[in-house]
Structure formats: structure tokens, C-alpha cells
Interface confidence: low
């Protein structure tokens, strides 16, 4: 048994007579043999769930669900209630109605076995019938909505009449009907004004019925019509078995360069026309099991269940359904030497499905794990300016396909063949498994005998110690020019183009800082700033070279405070700035301020 609504509404007035009928509550059957029996909760409750008083005023007919006043609500009774609701002049109180023999504790009132009946209390007597508007004669203030379970026996779920109006205003005639399309499963009995279902409903065919209730009021010569929405929602049960969309039960996958833990290797989709179990219960009740194969496969892969609600068309209307994505995921990083082919099977079980048929599917994943070989090109040729500053990035080395790698840990090393010419260093970028070449020793750059540098690049896979090698030939170009006096260590300090381009700074490949002119569009990623190289700084990412020294690119790497209009970077630096941004790395501060368009001559004069 279940209630067709979770809440009912009616009005209560002072001194309404004992015996006044108030409203009907309705229960629908889950099985044909069920007989509803209603009981009231012991207490009246206030708007904030405050327990106001024992219910001494309202009774229920256990078999019919009719609520009525068994004694008049006089002023003293009203005070008894209002005083506990801290004297609000208009009080809404509610009662809990239970379906026997549902043994719910009074403290809990949840659909389907309990409904709340709300009474709007008016500290006046019932108004004169002639003063009631048609809307008040026809429908409660709060519009009802109904919930009916699919596949259940048909039954009565609503009674249109406002019982106190009918009881106290017998001379006013009120008639009701339902506006509905052809073949809809509802009827309104003209005599009793009860609304019932004609047959069991199927949610997978239609989930919502937006009906319209029409009320016609006859009072003397006047006739008025009132219309209100009458929505019915069909509640789901697990009556559909899971299926494969387009019959696809097998997915094939190749694991090669992406070998990192948590990588999604392949996905298979399962469709279920139901939307139960509800999301909170779904993963517990809709199970997926990777069937035992070899131990290696069990340790290496796991299956993740990702359910999502979707909507499908049925009989011209949309109904909700569920798609379940089952992802085969790497449980650990795979070594580059791993080389296997296997078939994995996953058992999916919709454990709530009662049939007919089975709620079980078998998913197949064909997986090939390929080994990865490390290859470097035979030779790299690069040039570097003699004026380059320490930490200047001059190029990259990268094993074949390194941009595509994940979960493969390659370390790069440089072995210098020239004596005392260890000018360059290399660091491995975590992002793309490449090695970034940078200037490590500027003194060596200036030595005449270091005009041509020869290195061996060695790439080593940390897990297997497999290696690849390549020659690196670096030509040192240009002549050295000493730094201007008074230049800061960091390009980022400079606030104006002129002073920026006069100086070099840590990380500068040319020995000169570069000015990046912003777009001037408010707080923007393209703010004006002074950088060692606009190729790498700022780019919204503090790279592995820039992390070596905060003076290289504080715009990307600063963890300190940023003053002025900006959007902070994640997890550090300036993501977007207003106007020009300059930084003082030693003080761990950056400033973003409007563009300064003063004439440089004025600057000199002002000094």
C-alpha cells in the first residue's frame, strides 16, 4: 500500500463545528488483495516540525481515509497550539497519517507509508458562503500532485470535493471534470467525484501526465469555471533488464603509450530503461564484477561503473532511462616491457530486476598490452647565444612518442665530452616526458674553447633501466656583452618596456628580457609584462626549469601575494592580470596595475 500524495492541504477555522468533514486521504494498492487502513499520528506539528500538541481535535475513519473534526477548535484550543508556535497569528499545523499496518515510528514520515496533512489555521470563523471566490470553492490553495507506481492495480487516488465547503455551503453546486486526451488511463466519477486509474500504468511508456482539472460553480444564476493543472507522475520499478545498445558487448583496446594508473583503457555501455535503483543505491544494487582470470589481469585492471540518467522517446513523449558506462581502468602503472594479450569478462547484475528473463549481462574486453621501445634521433643540433643567462631554455630532447607517454618515467642525462664545457643541464618535464635543455653555466659559455659543445644525451626508463642515446651538438653563437649596471636579477621586476628591454635576467636565452604587450582587455590572461622569453614565460604554467629559481618567472611560479586586479593561478602565479603585472620575487609580491602611458621624458624630468 502507498499514498497517492505525500502531502495534503486544508483550511481550519475557529469554532468549526464538531463533525465537519475535512478531506480524504487515498491509498493505492501494490497487490490486488491489499485493504488499506489508516491511522493518525499522535501529535500536531508546527511549520518548523515543532511538536505542538497532542491531537485532540481531528479524527480519521480508518477504512475510508476521511479526516473530520471530532470537537470544535475553539479559541482556547487555538491558544494551546499557537502558544507553542510562539504566537504566530497564522499557523500551519500538520498531522501525520500512516498506513496500517506500516510500523513507522512517529518521528519519521516518509512516502510511501506516511503522508502529511497540513492545515492552514485562520483565527476567524468560517467565511460566509457568498463571500467565497470560485477558486476557493473549487480547489485547495496548494495544488496537488500525484504519484502512482507503475504496474500496480488500478484504484482511486483523489476526491475533488472540498468537504468543508460542501458541508457548510450546501446550496452551492460544484461540478468537476478532467480534461484529457484520448485513451488516457484516468477517469473522474461524476457522482462521487473520485479520480481513479482505469488500468495499471507503465512508466517506460509515459512518465508524466499533465492533466487539467475543470471546476464549474453554480451559485444561483451565476456559473463560473476554474481550471487548474492536475499533474500525475508515474513512479518507476525495476521491471526492465539491462541491454547492450546496438548489441555491442565487446570492446577492444591497445595499451601502449598511456600506461599510467587510472587510465581508461576501454568503455562498454549498458542501457536500462529503468531509473531505479535511485542514485544513492545504484552502485550497491547494480553490481559489476571482473570475472577471475589470471592473477596479473586481476591486479592490473579494475572496472568502474559510471551511471548516467538519459531520456528516450516513447509514444511521443520523453521518459527517463539510465545508461551505465563500464570502464576498464588500469589499476597500476605498467612497465614498458610488459607485453600481453588477454580477454577479460565483466559480469553486470541488476540485482533488483525481478524478471521475466535475467538481469545479468556479460561484458567482454579484448586487451593488448604492447611493449614500448625507447628511441632517440641519432643527433640533435642546437645553437645557443653567448649572451644567454643561466636557466635559459634552449631546446628539448624527447624519446620517440614521448608527448603521448603517461605512466612512463623517463629521465634524461647529459654526458659532456669536452673538458670544462659543461655549459648545459637537462631536466625532465613531468608533463610530456621530454627533457628540457637549459644553460647551467654561463662562464663556460664565454670560454673560446667552448664554442662548440658535444654531449651524449641518455634517456633512461626508471622502472626497467632501459636506455636510448643520442649525440647533441651545440654551437655557441654571437659575442658576449656585459650586463648594464643596476639591472635586476629577474626580468619580471621591470614595469616598463624600455627598462625591460635594456636588461637581461635569469632565464633569458638572448641576454635581453622581452616585453610582452597585453591586449588591454580588463583582467586578461594576456597582460603586459617583462619576461626572459615570451615562449615560456608567462604561459600559466610553472615549468620544471622555472621551478629552479623564483627569479626566472614569478608570473607563473610566485606563491606570495598579488596586489591589484588579477585572477590567481592554480596552484600559483598569475592566471590573469589587469594592465601591467610586475613582480619582486625576493619580497614574494606581484603587482597588477593599469598601463602606465607616461612619456619617458616626463619620467626623467619628474625625477
Amino acid at each position: 500500500l502507498y499514498f497517492s500524495r505525500d502531502a495534503y492541504w486544508e483550511k481550519l477555522y475557529v469554532d468549526q463545528a464538531a463533525g465537519t468533514p475535512l478531506l480524504y486521504v487515498h491509498a493505492l494498492r501494490d497487490a490486488p488483495e491489499e485493504v488499506p487502513s489508516f491511522r493518525l499520528g499522535q501529535h500536531l506539528y508546527g511549520t518548523y516540525r515543532t511538536r505542538l500538541h497532542e491531537n485532540n481535535w481531528i479524527c480519521i475513519q480508518e477504512d475510508t481515509g476521511l479526516l473530520y473534526l471530532n470537537r470544535s477548535l475553539d479559541h482556547s484550543s487555538w491558544e494551546k497550539l499557537s502558544v507553542r508556535n510562539r504566537g504566530f497569528p497564522l499557523l500551519t499545523v500538520y498531522l501525520k497519517v500512516f498506513l496500517s499496518p506500516t510500523s513507522l515510528r512517529e518521528g519519521e514520515c516518509q512516502w510511501p507509508g506516511c503522508a502529511r496533512v497540513y492545515f492552514s489555521f485562520f483565527n476567524t470563523s468560517f467565511p460566509a458562503c457568498s463571500s467565497l471566490k470560485p477558486r476557493e470553492l473549487c480547489f485547495p490553495e496548494t495544488r496537488p500532485s500525484f504519484r502512482i507506481r507503475e504496474n500496480r492495480p488500478p484504484g482511486t487516488f483523489h476526491q475533488f470535493r472540498l468537504l468543508p465547503v460542501q458541508f457548510l455551503c450546501p446550496n452551492i453546486s460544484v461540478a468537476y471534470r478532467l480534461l484529457e486526451g484520448e485513451g488516457l488511463p484516468f477517469r473522474c466519477a461524476p457522482d462521487s467525484l473520485e479520480v481513479s486509474t482505469r488500468w495499471a500504468l507503465d512508466r517506460e511508456q509515459r512518465e508524466k501526465y499533465e492533466l487539467v482539472a475543470v471546476c464549474t460553480v453554480h451559485a444561483g444564476a451565476r456559473e463560473e469555471v476554474v481550471m487548474v493543472p492536475f499533474p500525475v507522475t508515474v513512479y518507476d520499478e525495476d521491471d526492465s533488464a539491462p541491454t547492450f545498445p546496438a548489441g555491442v558487448d565487446t570492446a577492444s583496446a591497445v595499451v601502449e603509450f598511456k600506461r599510467k594508473e587510472d587510465t581508461v583503457v576501454a568503455t562498454l555501455r549498458v542501457f536500462d530503461a529503468d531509473v531505479v535503483p535511485a542514485s544513492g543505491e545504484l552502485v550497491r544494487r547494480y553490481t559489476s564484477t571482473l570475472l577471475p582470470g589470471d592473477t596479473w589481469a586481476q591486479q592490473t585492471f579494475r572496472v568502474e561503473h559510471w551511471p548516467n540518467e538519459t531520456s528516450v522517446q516513447a509514444n511521443g513523449s520523453f521518459v527517463r532511462a539510465t545508461v551505465h558506462d563500464y570502464r576498464l581502468v588500469l589499476n597500476r602503472n605498467l612497465s614498458i616491457s610488459e607485453n600481453r594479450t588477454m580477454q577479460l569478462a565483466v559480469l553486470v547484475n541488476d540485482s533488483d530486476f525481478q524478471g521475466p528473463g535475467a538481469g545479468v549481462l556479460l561484458l567482454h574486453f579484448n586487451v593488448s598490452v604492447l611493449p614500448v621501445s625507447l628511441h632517440l634521433p641519432s643527433t640533435y643540433s642546437l645553437s645557443v647565444s653567448r649572451r644567454a643567462r643561466r636557466f635559459a631554455q634552449i631546446g628539448k630532447v624527447c624519446v620517440e612518442n614521448c608527448q603521448a607517454f603517461s605512466g612512463i618515467n623517463v629521465q634524461y642525462k647529459l654526458h659532456s665530452s669536452g673538458a670544462n664545457c659543461s655549459t648545459l643541464g637537462v631536466v625532465t618535464s613531468a608533463e610530456d616526458t621530454s627533457g628540457i635543455l637549459f644553460v647551467n653555466d654561463t662562464k663556460a659559455l664565454r670560454r673560446p674553447k667552448c664554442a662548440e659543445l658535444h654531449y651524449m644525451v641518455v634517456a633512461t626508463d626508471q622502472q626497467t633501466s632501459r636506455q636510448a642515446q643520442a649525440q647533441l651538438l651545440v654551437t655557441v653563437e654571437g659575442s658576449y656583452v656585459a650586463e648594464e649596471a643596476g639591472c635586476p636579477l629577474s626580468c619580471a621586476v621591470s614595469k616598463r618596456r624600455l627598462e625591460c628591454e635594456e636588461c637581461g635576467g635569469l632565464g633569458s636565452p638572448t641576454g635581453r628580457c622581452e616585453w610582452r604587450q597585453g591586449d588591454g582587455k580588463g583582467i586578461t590572461r594576456n597582460f603586459s609584462t617583462c619576461s626572459p622569453s615570451t615562449k615560456t614565460c608567462p604561459d600559466g604554467h610553472c615549468d620544471v626549469v622555472e621551478t629552479q629559481d623564483i627569479n626566472i618567472c614569478p608570473q607563473d611560479c610566485l606563491r606570495g601575494s598579488i596586489v591589484g586586479g588579477h585572477e590567481p593561478g592554480e596552484p600559483r602565479g598569475i592566471k590573469a592580470g589587469y594592465g601591467t603585472c610586475n613582480c619582486f620575487p625576493e619580497e614574494e609580491k606581484c603587482f597588477c596595475e593599469p598601463e602606465d602611458i607616461q612619456d619617458p621624458l616626463c619620467d626623467e624630468l619628474c625625477r
Epitope: 518548523y48 482556547s76 491558544e79 494551546k80 502558544v83 510562539r86 504566537g87 504566530f88
Partner: antibody, heavy 118, light 107 residues
Framework: EVQLVESGGGLVQPGGSLRLSCAAS????????MSWVRQAPGKGLEWVSG????????FYVDSMKGRFTISRDNSKNTLYLQMNSLRVEDTAVYFC???????????WGQGTLVTVSS | DIQLTQSPSFLSASVGDRVTITCWAS??????LAWYQQKPGKAPKVLIY???TLQSGVPSRISGSGSGTEFTLTISSLQPEDFAAYYC?????????FGQGTKLEIK
């Protein structure tokens, strides 16, 4: 002008009784809930008891139920707190407070000191 | 019974400072909370009720916010007369309960 004046406090031995009174003026006494709130020396506020405007409904903090009785005489605009079986821990300043319709205490008396000591 | 927990218990501040006192309820009390100020030897005085409504006659530098289980009292710019004890009180149901209090003293 709303005025609440408490009286009846004093020194009493453990196990003894006291009756506190609160004379109210400046508002329609029968319309409002009234409460007693106490404050032990150097401690915080503790709500003790409340009563509805007509006097038909009374409320107590659990630890005082059965020992304390709140009442009111609407013809005299007076609130009472009868305290029996007093304990040392009942030593406090007892305030009478008018409850606003919303529920908060918008007017308070000056308080009366109750000392329970042997 | 509904328990109220105030934080901090003691607060040192200077004239002109902005201070915030927090009150947590052991269960949802909607907006049914009041704040009181009490000076030594005096009766409490209501400042805020319904969590955020200023009692008439209370200066606008005092404000309240919150609902459910977390509430705050804020004094935007402390004045010499604001140094006192502050209490929150739930008005959701009997027995009414108070927080343990926050003593605001001059730094």
C-alpha cells in the same frame, strides 16, 4: 514603559524553598509568554522555565522539573517561580524576562540573587 | 535538548576592529536564533533575533547572519561600549538554550 521587577531572593539552606515574584507593568501582561532565566556567579545564562499568556501551558528545563513551579496571576500582572528542594548549584541571579511574539527576550528585570548555602 | 556552542570563548580586540563570533547548533534550528549582550552586573540586552533582524535601538554596526546550524554575530567597527559578554540563544523549541558565552575584552 515596560518594567519588570523581581523580588523574593535571599539566602536559603539546601533543601529549603523560595518563591520569586516578578511584577510587570507597561505592557498587556496576558498577551505574552514570560520566562525565568538564571545566571550562576561568573557563569553564562541558563533558561529555567516559561509560561504561556493565560498560564495554561508551562515549560521547564529537565533538571528543574518537579522542583520548580512557574505560575502567573494575570489579575496582578505578576509572574512567580516557586523553588523547592533547593541545591547549592541553584545559587544564581534569577532574571524574569518578557518573551516577544517572535520568542526572544526583549525586556528583562534587574535580577534577584538566590544563595543556597549551609 | 538543542545544544549551542559559541566560539571563541574569549576574544581580545581593539577599538575599530571588526570581530565575528560564531554559534553552532547541535541540530537545524532554521533562523530561530537571538544574540544578546550583557555587561557586568546588568541584565542581558537583545541585539539580533530571527538570526539577522536587528532589534530596534541597536546600532547598525552590529549584524547577524546564518541559518540551520551555523550563525555569526559581527561587529564591523568596535566601539568602547561594545566590550561585554555575548550570548546566542535558540528559539526553536523548549527548553530554550543559550550558548556558553563569548567574553569580548579590550586588547
Amino acid at each position: 514603559e515596560v518594567q519588570l521587577v523581581e523580588s523574593g531572593g535571599g539566602l536559603v539552606q539546601p533543601g529549603g524553598s523560595l518563591r520569586l515574584s516578578c511584577a510587570a507593568s507597561g505592557f498587556t501582561f496576558t498577551t505574552y509568554f514570560m520566562s525565568w532565566v538564571r545566571q550562576a556567579p561568573g557563569k553564562g545564562l541558563e533558561w529555567v522555565s516559561g509560561i504561556s499568556g493565560s498560564g495554561t501551558s508551562t515549560f521547564y528545563v529537565d533538571s528543574m522539573k518537579g522542583r520548580f513551579t512557574i505560575s502567573r496571576d494575570n489579575s496582578k500582572n505578576t509572574l512567580y517561580l516557586q523553588m523547592n528542594s533547593l541545591r547549592v548549584e541553584d545559587t544564581a541571579v534569577y532574571f524574569c524576562a518578557k518573551e516577544n511574539t517572535y520568542g526572544h527576550f526583549d525586556f528583562w528585570g534587574q535580577g534577584t540573587l538566590v544563595t543556597v548555602s549551609s | 535538548d538543542i545544544q549551542l556552542t559559541q566560539s571563541p570563548s574569549f576574544l581580545s580586540a581593539s577599538v575599530g576592529d571588526r570581530v565575528t563570533i560564531t554559534c553552532w547548533a547541535s541540530q537545524d534550528i532554521s533562523s530561530h536564533l537571538a544574540w544578546y549582550q550583557q555587561k557586568p552586573g546588568k541584565a542581558p540586552k537583545v541585539l539580533i533575533y530571527d538570526a539577522s533582524t536587528l532589534q530596534s535601538g541597536v546600532p547598525s554596526r552590529i549584524s547577524g547572519s546564518g541559518s540551520g546550524t551555523e550563525f555569526t554575530l559581527t561587529i564591523s567597527s568596535l566601539q568602547p561600549e561594545d566590550f561585554a559578554a555575548y550570548y546566542c540563544q535558540q528559539l526553536d523549541g523548549y527548553p530554550y538554550t543559550f550558548g556558553q558565552g563569548t567574553k569580548l575584552e579590550i586588547k
